[in-house]
Structure formats: C-alpha cells, structure tokens
C-alpha cells in the first residue's frame, strides 16, 4: 500500500466542514484509512473514516459543528493526518499543517430562480450557502448557460468579479429551452478553488410576438 503515488487534498467550506480526498495508486480497496484533525487552538479533535469513491480514491468529511457555525478562523492551524491500518497499528501516510482560509472551497450556490424572462433575455438570481461572514464582499462568481445542441464544456464562462448574486443573460433566442449554472470562489487563499457548480436551472425564453398585418 506504500509504493503507489499518493495524494492528499483537503478544503474548508468556510464554516464547519473540512472535506478531504485521499488517493493512492495500487492501494487495496479494503484498506482501512481515516483522517485525523488536530487543531492548534481548539479543544476538539476530529476523525472521519475515508470511504471509497473510485478505484484508488477515498473521501471523507470532518464535520466540525452545525452547518452555519463559524468553527475556524484565519489564524487557526489544523494538522491533518491520513492514518491507514497496517496489521495491528496505524501508519501515518500523509500529514499537513492545514490553514483553513488558504484552502477554501465553498458549497455550490443554491436557490437559483428566474426573476424575469423575456424573448431575448433572462434575469436569474441565486444565494450562497454556508459562506463565512469574514468574506464580506470578497467573492467572485462564474456562470455558464447551456444552449440547445451544445455541452456544458462548450458553454462560454461568464465571470462576475464581485459579490453579485444575480445575472442578466442577453442575446438569447426566443422560445428556446436553456439551462444555467453558477459557482463561487473567495478571493482569499493560495490553494482556494472554485465551488462545485450549482444544480442546473432550466428556463425557457418567451416566444417572439407575431408580426401584425398592415
């Protein structure tokens, strides 16, 4: 279980969850491993069991408290270890001093809704979920619209460089079905990454008005 290439990556959702992924080529699927969290200035220790998500990849969530509680700050350091059972003992496979606000990945935006739709444009709003108040307005968003006959990968990215929880999509085709997604990222943190994409919101533009006979 030791010889394969291994990777240990964790992200903090900015509130009360640290999600970790451990991958190792050549490791046995039934290997028992866990993540142990040891903070430098908190009274708690936490452990989560790594569960298989693919052939050589395991994941778990360190749940630190109620979803919207602020369990860590910018000054916290949490030492994270991957421990795997080898016979009767646990072996440290990976270790890092984790700075939560250097390793952020927020929850996907929620509550997407169509505010107003016309023939060529559509106004959509959303909300961010479980995001720390520390960010104030220091967030950015990316959005994409799925057009008929295209894939999500082909959809151009629209960037919102500020905390703007709405968008007005323009130059749309009348009477056409679209889907829309958005994701969020704090500006803070060297290893911070984009949230997952939101659940797609389906909408249809209004038909063009029929021309009147003269």
């Amino acid at each position: 279980a030791v010889n394969g290439t291994s990777q240990f990556t964790c992200f903090y959702n900015s509130r009360a969850n640290i999600s970790c992924v451990w991958s190792q080529d050549g490791a046995l699927q039934d290997t028992s491993c866990q993540v142990h969290a040891w903070p430098d200035r908190r009274r708690w220790n936490q452990t989560c069991e790594l569960l298989p998500v693919s052939q050589a990849s395991w994941a778990c969530n360190l749940i630190l408290g109620a979803p919207d509680s602020q369990k860590l700050t910018t000054v916290d350091i949490v030492t994270l270890r991957v421990l795997c059972r080898e016979g009767v003992r646990w072996r440290v496979m990976a270790i890092q001093d984790f700075k939560p606000f250097e390793n952020l990945r927020l929850m996907a935006p929620i509550s997407l809704q169509v505010v107003h739709v016309e023939t060529h444009r559509c106004n959509i709003s959303w909300e961010i979920s479980q995001a720390s108040h520390y960010f104030e307005r220091h967030l950015e968003f990316e959005a994409r619209t799925l057009s008929p006959g295209h894939t999500w990968e082909e959809a151009p990215l629209l960037t919102l460089k500020q905390k703007q929880e709405w968008i007005c999509l323009e130059t749309l085709t009348p009477d056409t079905q679209y889907e829309f997604q958005v994701r969020v990222k704090p500006l803070q943190g060297e290893f911070t990454t984009w949230s997952p994409w939101s659940q797609p919101l389906a909408f249809r533009t209004k038909p063009a008005a029929l021309g009147k006979d003269t």
Partner: nanobody, 126 residues
C-alpha cells in the same frame, strides 16, 4: 522566484555539533512542507528530515533519529537543522528542499519536492 540558501556548514570533530540554516524567499514559506536532504561523496541523494508548514509534524531518517532536530521560524522564513553527536558518515553536502504543497508523505519522503538549494558542505573528521 523560489530561492533557498543554506548556511552553517563546516568541519567538525566526531561527537560534535553543528547547526544549519536555510533562508527561503519567493513563496509563502508557511504554506509549504520543507525537508533536508544530503549527498555524501559518490553517493545518491538521501532524505534526512521533513517538517510541516507550521512545524507541528516532523519526521526523520532512521540514521539521524535522536541526533538531528529539524525546525522552522516562519516569521524569518528560515528552516533549521540542528545536528548533534555527529559521525564521519554524516559527511555530505546538505540541501534544504521545498515540497510542492503543504502535504508531506512519510512513506515516500522524496516525493513532491520541487526546489532545493545549492547546499552547504558538512565534514565530520578528526
């Protein structure tokens, strides 16, 4: 760009002590695990010790365990190696090395190093 500059090497008698320093620049020092490696004359690179970003985790090669201590001062962007009870077989060029992330993998300590310094010579001889 990343720069790692070692200092503190020299000639020391067996049983003596020496302290090495590594001044780091060009990256956020505390965000990365660091290590010391060495190369004896005519030999390959050998891992000596590793330390996590805030020094809460350390690990040593069996050959130096109990004699060497790795530490860091993130305010000064400096990595240290205190070497006690030195032996002739500790003679080598000592390099400070940066890992490519905050994570260090004890079973494979050579993995993930992306930069190392020019080295400082340590000679243990009577």
């Amino acid at each position: 760009q990343v720069q790692l500059v070692e200092s503190g090497g020299g000639l020391v008698q067996p049983g003596g002590s020496l302290g090495l320093s590594c001044a780091a620049s060009g990256f956020t020092f505390s965000n990365y695990a660091m290590s010391w490696v060495r190369q004896a004359p005519g030999k390959g690179l050998e891992w000596v010790a590793s330390i996590t970003g805030f020094g809460r985790g350390t690990d040593y090669a069996d050959s130096v365990k109990g004699r060497f201590t790795v530490s860091r001062d993130n305010a000064k962007n400096t990595l240290y190696l205190q070497m006690n009870s030195l032996k002739p077989e500790d003679t080598a060029v000592y390099y400070c090395a940066k890992y490519s992330s905050s994570t260090y993998y004890p079973p494979t300590p050579a993995r993930g190093r992306d930069y190392r310094g020019q080295g400082t010579q340590v000679t243990v001889s009577s």
